[in-house]
């Protein structure tokens, strides 16, 4: 899969949106979930409905929201009042029982605010010097990682 | 009309190979799971594992991976299910069916083949 | 995997009495993914419920599904003779999708 980056401004709402083939993942429940390190398990944020004909219904958990338009195939997810600590790589799934297929891998990337003028060193998003694997642009504003970059801030 | 036909019956010995069709007709073939499931003599229903012609997306039972391959050719809309090298054991009735897009999210398996039986003696 | 139990494994009724067939799964699956199909010998399987109780096109209101989590029922309300046959229940709940072992529905 390749990874998609999304960016958002901090304080601002930012929305992913995850297409797919609806007719391949018919009557599938969505999720959207966090990757907990590179090799790591991807940890639930909010799934869709559980009826999955209410897909269409926003589910909130915290500043995050998810719905579902199972015919056009699009799962939107909004996160609202964007923080640096959402910075990250995550996760679109399709749900089968216990297990998942991923729709797509999404880096999110969190921008400081122009209009705010505190320190924003905190405020971490991939440097363009860095390089990223399996890169393809998509605006939101997003776009994709570039080749050999990573999609986890260096730790020290 | 909907349907899937499946090709003849096949007699073979131990060790041959063999590779079976299903072929779907009268509705968008690309769009739909097809699955297989065997059926041995005088037995029940045993799903083998199901593929997406759309993409050729494969899922398998643990009790038939490795053992078996599911294919498709989206353009003769015709699914496949194949031996590289037939046990006796492999002596069964095999149908191919697809699984149906119902409202409200509900699938099940919806349109069946005739069947195929397949016969493995020596 | 999620294995499905049917019972009980042969069911001996006449014409025009009740069927009551189960199927208990060995964990939870959603009422969304729980069928039940009828096979006549010589015949291959006909989908009669899906979703756990909604019936197929042109299967007859005599047949209805119930049932959620690990237990599910098919009742068949008056059997008729072209009735007897093998019932199996499958889900498509989680992979691999798992069928049960059947009932055999069988004239006293």
């Known amino acids: 899969h390749n990874t998609t980056v999304f960016q958002g401004v901090a304080g601002q709402s930012l929305q992913v949106s995850c297409p797919y083939d609806s007719m391949k993942h018919w009557g599938r429940r969505k999720a959207w979930c966090r990757q907990l390190g590179e090799k790591g398990p991807c940890q639930r944020v909010v799934s869709t409905h559980n009826l999955w004909l209410l897909s269409f219904l926003r589910r909130w958990n915290g500043s995050t929201a998810i719905t579902d338009d199972t015919l056009g195939g699009t799962l939107t997810i909004t996160l609202r009042n964007l923080q640096p600590h959402d910075a990250g790589l995550y996760q679109c799934q399709s749900l089968h029982g216990s297990e998942a297929d991923t729709l797509r891998k999404v880096l999110v990337e969190v921008l400081a605010d122009p209009l705010d003028h505190r320190d924003a060193g905190d405020l971490w998003f991939p440097g363009e010097s860095e390089s990223f694997e399996d890169a393809h642009v998509e605006h939101s504003i997003s776009r994709s990682l570039l080749e050999g970059e990573i999609p986890f801030p260096p730790t020290s | 009309e909907v349907q899937l036909v499946q090709s003849g019956a096949e007699v073979k010995k131990p060790g041959e190979s063999l590779k079976i069709s299903c072929k779907g007709s009268?509705?968008?073939?690309?769009?739909?799971?097809i699955g297989w499931v065997r059926q041995m003599p005088g037995k029940g229903l045993e799903w083998m594992g199901i593929?997406?012609?759309?993409?050729?997306?494969?899922r398998y039972s643990p009790s038939f991976q490795g053992q078996v391959t599911i294919s498709a050719d989206k353009s003769i809309s015709t699914a496949y299910l194949q031996w590289s090298s037939l046990k006796a054991s492999d002596t069964a009735m095999y149908y191919c069916?697809?699984?149906?897009?119902?409202?409200?999210?509900?699938?099940?398996?919806?349109?069946w083949g005739q069947g195929t039986t397949v016969t493995v003696s020596s | 995997e999620i294995v499905l139990t049917q019972s009980p494994g042969t069911l001996s009724l006449s014409p025009g009495e009740r069927a009551t067939l189960s199927c208990r799964a060995s964990?939870?699956?959603?009422?969304?993914?729980l069928a039940w199909y009828q096979q006549k010998p010589g015949q291959a399987p006909r989908l009669l419920i899906y979703?756990?109780?909604s019936r197929a096109t042109g299967i007859p209101d005599r047949f209805s599904g119930s049932g959620s989590g690990t237990d599910f029922t098919l009742t068949i309300s008056r059997l008729e003779p072209e009735d007897f046959a093998v019932y199996y229940c499958?889900?498509?709940?989680?992979?691999?999708?798992?069928f049960g072992g059947g009932t055999k529905v069988e004239i006293k």
């Open positions: 009268g509705y968008s073939f690309t769009t739909y799971w």
């Open positions: 979703g756990a109780s």
């Open positions: 964990q939870s699956v959603s009422s969304d993914y």
């Open positions: 069916a697809r699984a149906g897009h119902y409202d409200g999210g509900h699938l099940g398996m919806d349109v």
């Open positions: 499958q889900q498509d709940y989680s992979y691999p999708w798992t």
């Open positions: 593929i997406y012609p759309g993409d050729s997306d494969t």
